[in-house]
Interface confidence: low
């Protein structure tokens, strides 16, 4: 069901954002720089 797929996808997106914020806060500029250089 497309709505279910979309909902699940967005839920994962929310979680990814939370993880990204956590990593940015904990690792700071080093994390951002590493991502940039990949």
């Amino acid at each position: 069901h497309s709505d279910g797929i979309f909902t699940d996808s967005y839920s994962r997106y929310r979680k990814q954002m939370a993880v990204k914020k956590y990593l940015a806060a904990v690792l700071g500029k080093r994390y951002k720089q590493r991502v940039k250089n990949k």
Epitope: R14, K15, M17, A18, K21
Partner: antibody
């Protein structure tokens, strides 16, 4: 940390208009930014947001009428073809979320757009 | 379309009294708690009071309390002060990547 909108002015219907939100003290690579508008004497209306990865999401009524874009320190809202119904104060706000909450925690003072012939 | 119904539209309160504002959603907000409350005074931007349905924003007096989950939420202002005269809005954040404001409640302090 601050947010400030600019670019609001009197325009005639159909004249494209771009509003700019300038942020300082935090990074747009970490935070999402949201646009909210308020017609004179009316309630708040959510327009949409642009996320930290540059993807834009719009309210169902706003799709096709507004476009968001951003640089490292600014977020733009473009009204392609304004109508008199777009007359409002436009607010830019930092849209922060975690898995456990969502919040619009930092607002600009707003910029007034008047659409009139 | 999702509807977020705020009641009452206007309420009068005496200084020292208590005010309750209800916010009912036609669908559950994201995570059952992605609901915020804002205070707005004329000529000013909205000010965040409560987020996550019940978490007090920084610098907001503990007289403000948020409760509820899913589709039904309440903002309670205890020991009402003159400075609390304002319009209050709830904001729901939904799985469909849409945020909806309630219609607002004007609080008049006598």
């Amino acid at each position: 940390q601050s947010v400030e909108e600019s670019g609001g002015r009197l325009v005639t219907p159909g004249t494209p208009l771009t509003l700019t939100c300038t942020v300082s003290g935090f990074s747009l690579s970490t935070y999402n930014m949201c646009w909210v508008r308020q017609a004179p004497g009316k309630g708040l209306e959510w327009v949409g947001f642009i996320n930290s990865d540059d993807s834009a999401y719009y309210a169902s009524w706003a799709k096709g009428r507004f476009t968001f874009s951003k640089t490292s320190t600014t977020v733009d809202l473009k009204i392609a073809s304004p109508t008199t119904e777009d007359t409002a104060t436009y607010f830019c706000a930092r849209y922060d979320w975690d898995y456990y909450y969502s919040r619009l925690d930092l607002w600009g003072p707003g910029t007034l757009v008047t659409v009139s012939s | 379309d999702i509807v977020l119904t705020q009641t009452p539209a206007s309420v009068s309160a005496a200084v020292g009294g208590t005010v309750s504002i209800s916010c009912q959603s036609s669908e559950s907000v994201y995570n059952n708690n992605y609901l915020s409350w804002f205070q707005q005074k004329p000529g000013q931007p909205p000010k965040l009071l409560i987020y996550g349905a019940s978490t007090l924003a920084s610098g907001v007096p503990s007289r403000f309390e948020g409760s509820g989950s899913g589709t039904q939420f309440t903002l309670t202002i205890s020991d009402v002060q003159c400075d609390d005269a304002a319009t209050y809005y709830c904001l729901g954040d939904y799985i469909i990547i849409e945020n909806i404001f309630g219609g607002g409640t004007e609080v008049v302090v006598k």
